[in-house]
């Protein structure tokens, strides 16, 4: 990281340091501690107070984003004294440089794309680097497929997603021969910024008086069981007149996906396309392709 | 219409074991997620352990760790649970139940169920 | 000993609607994890009636609803009819091992 860390201390200092690879911070252990607390102060004045680790002379932060610059601080308490110590990280370059409107999605159900633009006060030629973590193993994923602009980097593919977990830490940084780029991070959810694609093997079967519509639940990235899905089908009559409204119809996932409605012979030509969500967030796909049944002169 | 299709009754002595199968018809056991719950009248439910998707892997209840084993046998659509080192207040009604919500942990369908008694 | 809370019994006439309780924790419904509802019929396996706090799989009527409210949940059956006496069992998910936790169930009596 570029980012310059200043230390604000008393004299007998406790040397606090953090390292934003394993967002650990640490500070050198003292004889007879009888407590010890850590935090981070944000710029909107949120504490965010991590488990100590078992040696209490460091403590890591799970799920914080640092580009807005944040400020550690140490208490610890022996039995002969008390040191505090602050430790700021700020986003050190020039302000404005950093990458924005970042935005990642995933969908196939295993590529993902991450988009970003060049900061307004970047110079022309600003590169900018992105670097994924995921929550468990803390293993950095390099952007394998930069998308350029002018040679400068604007995004991301990636087409394994194996290294990625329910939650993952996204960093932006920035180089530059002229001046300091600042980075910009943020946290995203996996379920959030999947994009499903639309149900698949879509079938219509009628008889005399019904007609049933059966489909399969997506292939998707997070694993996903059949009542997490929530589904949109829209059975459309053709050639009704322009502002004829379409029947949507909701249902829930089920292990048999199927949708059986009443439809008598003779029947007009329909059509019925599907789509598919993440039940908790209905996010919804495009439409699977249309389907007809019926007949013209129904 | 998916069903789940448990081995019958067993009868066994404190020490032992017992392996009892739940086989899945009208789907594919590749596709679902398989969870293991037993039930007494003194404890009610306890849940034992499943296929966790998530992980990848099959995970146990804390107090059964070491006793018991769940596997899969996806070619013929069966899932397996052995309990070892049997004791009395192990009788009870065994299910094997097909997960319907991943993130959201809900059993949509259940097999009837499998009694072990364990009795000296 | 059950981690959710259930009365152990509730009973209603037929046509009467009759609302059964459950309470969990911080670890579980209040997390906040989502909440499940079972029906178990004498002598048979459990039937999911309710999922995510309160939907319906397809085939269970609209007779029966549920909410859920900071660490509590509860479900709701009105119109009772003579074949809803049965036993009655919530479930969620907590961050403690073990993972998936039930109630101890509760004895609907149709009078």
């Known amino acids: 990281e570029k980012s310059d860390l200043r230390t604000v201390a008393p004299a007998s200092s406790l040397n606090v340091r953090f390292d934003s690879r394993t967002m650990n911070l640490s500070w050198d252990c003292q004889e007879n501690t009888t407590f010890s607390k850590c935090f981070l102060t944000d710029k909107k004045n949120r504490v965010v107070e991590p488990r100590l680790s078992n040696n209490e002379c460091s403590c890591t932060f799970r799920e914080i984003c640092l580009h807005e610059g944040v400020t550690f601080e140490v208490h610890v308490n022996t039995s002969q004294r008390g040191f505090q110590q602050k430790l700021l990280y700020p986003n050190s370059g020039r302000e404005g440089t950093a990458a924005q409107n970042f935005s990642c999605f995933i969908y196939n159900a295993d590529l993902m794309n991450c988009t970003w633009a060049r900061g307004p006060t970047a110079p022309r030629d600003v590169q900018y680097f992105l670097y994924i973590r995921n929550s468990k193993r803390r293993r950095e994923i390099r952007c394998p497929y930069y998308i350029q602009d002018s040679g400068t980097h604007v995004g991301c593919h990636l087409d394994n997603l194996s290294g990625l977990t329910s939650r993952n830490y996204f960093l932006v940084n920035g180089t530059s021969r002229e001046i300091g780029i600042q980075f910009f991070d943020s946290l995203l959810d996996t379920k959030k910024i999947e994009r499903f694609n639309p149900p698949s093997n879509v079938t219509v079967r009628c008889n005399t008086t019904h007609c049933l519509v059966r489909w399969k639940q997506p292939r998707t990235y997070q694993k996903l069981s059949y009542l997490d899905f929530q589904y949109q089908l829209d059975v459309h009559r053709k050639n009704t007149q322009p502002g004829t409204e379409n029947l949507l119809i909701n249902v829930s996932g089920d292990l048999e996906n199927r949708y059986n409605f009443p439809s008598s012979e003779p029947r007009a030509k329909h059509s019925v396309k599907i789509r598919a969500a993440d039940v908790r967030i209905l996010n919804w796909s495009s439409w699977s392709e249309a389907i007809e049944f019926g007949s013209d002169d129904g | 219409q998916v069903q789940l299709v448990q081995s019958g009754a067993e009868v066994k002595k404190p020490g032992a074991s017992v392996k009892v199968s739940c086989k899945i018809s009208?789907?594919?056991?590749?596709?679902?997620?398989i969870h293991w719950v037993r039930q007494t009248p003194t404890k009610g439910f306890e849940w034992m352990g499943g296929f966790d998707p998530e992980e990848n892997e099959i995970v146990y209840a804390q107090r059964f760790q070491g006793r018991v084993t769940m596997t899969e046998d996806t070619s013929i659509d069966t899932a397996y649970l052995t309990l070892s080192s049997l004791r009395s207040d192990d009788t009870a009604v065994y299910y094997c139940a097909i997960v319907g919500s991943v993130s959201r942990i809900t059993y949509g369908f259940w097999g009837k169920g499998t009694m072990v008694t364990v009795s000296s | 000993q059950a981690v959710l809370t259930q009365p152990s019994s509730v009973s209603g006439a037929p046509g009467q609607r009759v609302t059964i309780s459950c309470t969990g924790s911080g670890s579980n419904i209040g997390a906040p994890y989502d909440v499940s509802w079972y029906q178990q019929l004498p002598g048979t396996a459990p039937k999911l009636l309710i999922y995510?706090?309160?939907k319906r799989p397809s085939g269970v009527p609209d007779r029966f609803s549920a909410s859920k409210s900071g660490t509590s949940a509860s479900l709701a059956i009105t119109g009772l009819q003579a074949d809803d006496e049965a036993d009655y069992y919530c479930?969620?998910?907590?961050?403690?091992?073990?993972?998936?936790?039930f109630g101890g169930g509760t004895k609907l009596t149709v009078l």
């Open positions: 995510h706090n309160n």
């Open positions: 009208g789907h594919s056991l590749s596709e679902l997620s």
């Open positions: 479930q969620s998910y907590d961050s403690r091992n073990p993972h998936v936790i």
